[in-house]
């Protein structure tokens, strides 16, 4: 058993049929010594008496808010949550496996630049009685500070018969050095509580591996005289790290016909312009990637040829 926060405790249980559970000692936070009784949740049924109470916790019916009383007055509370371990593996019932980039991916994180700011998100089908708490650090043995905000519901989607809820959180490394080579990974830890069930999820990454630039901005077409060719130009996204001479991007320019089946013409360039043939009803799209490190491509920025 360990304390999650004041008056909230997590009991770690091996979860199998007829498991003996854990014996937990509860102590009433009071100077009183006599006449103390204990109840669980809203029940008026008395569980026991005394300043300390030893209880057996083996199922969710044993979790909940234990309250000590004296003469009808509430003295203190202890909320017990359960963390299930089945066949040596902690439960992952609350969050959905996103299966990207690999199985058992519950947290996904992205950074728009090297400033030390990043966003993580996760999915669940649970809509109520759900709380999240996020902590992060650079390294784990001698952790350096990363400050995370509160997790917020960022999207709701309908997937077949189910509703899916996306939560996200923004974090910022306290003393980020954008140009430095990373040697210790960022660690992100999410505590998830659904009713009386506790779970924790972790992710470990280097900022360089989660970089995904915003799409190029100000995408423009300039027709070339007496030609079907056009000059496409764009700019670095505002959110990308500066100076651009050091934090350089490479770009992919694509000409796509109206039909998905039509052949795509693609040009790769380190410049912020390119000359392409603009077919009727086609569109031109440009995306960006870190020039020196193969992290994710940005989403496409697009304009119609006409």
């Amino acid at each position: 058993i360990w304390e999650l926060k004041k008056d909230v405790y997590v009991v770690e249980l091996d979860w199998y049929p007829d498991a003996p559970g854990e014996m937990v000692v509860l102590t009433c936070d009071t100077p009183e010594e006599d006449g103390i009784t204990w109840t669980l949740d809203q029940s008026s049924e008395v569980l026991g008496s005394g300043k300390t109470l030893t209880i057996q916790v083996k199922e969710f019916g044993d979790a909940g808010q234990y309250t000590c009383h004296k003469g009808g007055e509430v003295l203190s509370h202890s909320l017990l949550l359960l963390h299930k371990k089945e066949d040596g593996i902690w439960s992952t019932d609350i969050l959905k496996d996103q299966k990207e980039p690999k199985n058992k991916t519950f947290l996904r994180c992205e950074a728009k630049n090297y400033s030390g700011r990043f966003t993580c998100w996760w999915l669940t089908t649970i809509s109520t009685d759900l709380t999240f708490s996020v902590k992060s650090s650079r390294g784990s043995s001698d952790p350096q500070g990363v400050t995370c905000g509160a997790a917020t519901l960022s999207a709701e989607r309908v997937r077949g018969d189910n509703k899916e809820y996306e939560y996200s959180v923004e974090c910022q490394e306290d003393s980020a050095c954008p140009a430095a080579e990373e040697s210790l990974p960022i660690e992100v830890m999410v505590d998830a509580v659904h009713k009386l069930k506790y779970e924790n999820y972790t992710s470990s990454f280097f900022i360089r591996d989660i970089i995904k630039p915003d799409p190029p901005k100000n995408l423009q077409l300039k027709p070339l005289k007496n030609s079907r060719q056009v000059e496409v130009s764009w700019e670095y996204p505002d959110t990308w790290s500066t100076p651009h001479s050091y934090f350089s991007l490479t770009f992919c320019v694509q000409v796509q016909g109206k039909s998905k089946r039509e052949k795509k013409d693609r040009v790769f360039t380190d410049k912020t312009s390119a000359t392409v043939i603009c077919r009727k009803n086609a569109s031109i799209s440009v995306r960006a990637q870190d020039r020196y490190y193969s992290s994710s491509w940005s989403e496409w920025a697009s304009v119609p040829c006409s």
């Epitope: 559970g21 009784t37 008395v46 569980l47 209880i55 057996q56 199922e59 019916g61």
Partner: nanobody, 115 residues
Framework: EVQLVESGGGLVQPGGSLRLSCAAS????????MYWFRQAPGKGHEWVST????????AYADSVKGRFTISRDNAKNTLYLQMNSLKPEDTALYYC????????RGQGTQVTVSS
Amino acid sequence: EVQLVESGGGLVQPGGSLRLSCAASGFSISDNWMYWFRQAPGKGHEWVSTIKTGTGSTAYADSVKGRFTISRDNAKNTLYLQMNSLKPEDTALYYCARDWDGTVRGQGTQVTVSS
């Protein structure tokens, strides 16, 4: 008629063991929280242990934790209290109850721990 009858008490040396039984009739112990209490000579009654409905999770007073074990046999409709490493201060009249306030309780069985 709702009834509880305890048995298994006796005289035992310090460090010894006893197993108390509480046979219930007129109701099912598996549907109720069940309690063991004790009353030492010249003292008030003291809660010892509780067993809950469902999976039968248990609770113990500080004075007996790690030494006493409460259990039940639903088929026999009987409650038990296994008492190990007995001490002279465990000497008391032990009784089982269906309610915290002792509305439904047995007459008790005497346990004496003495050398």
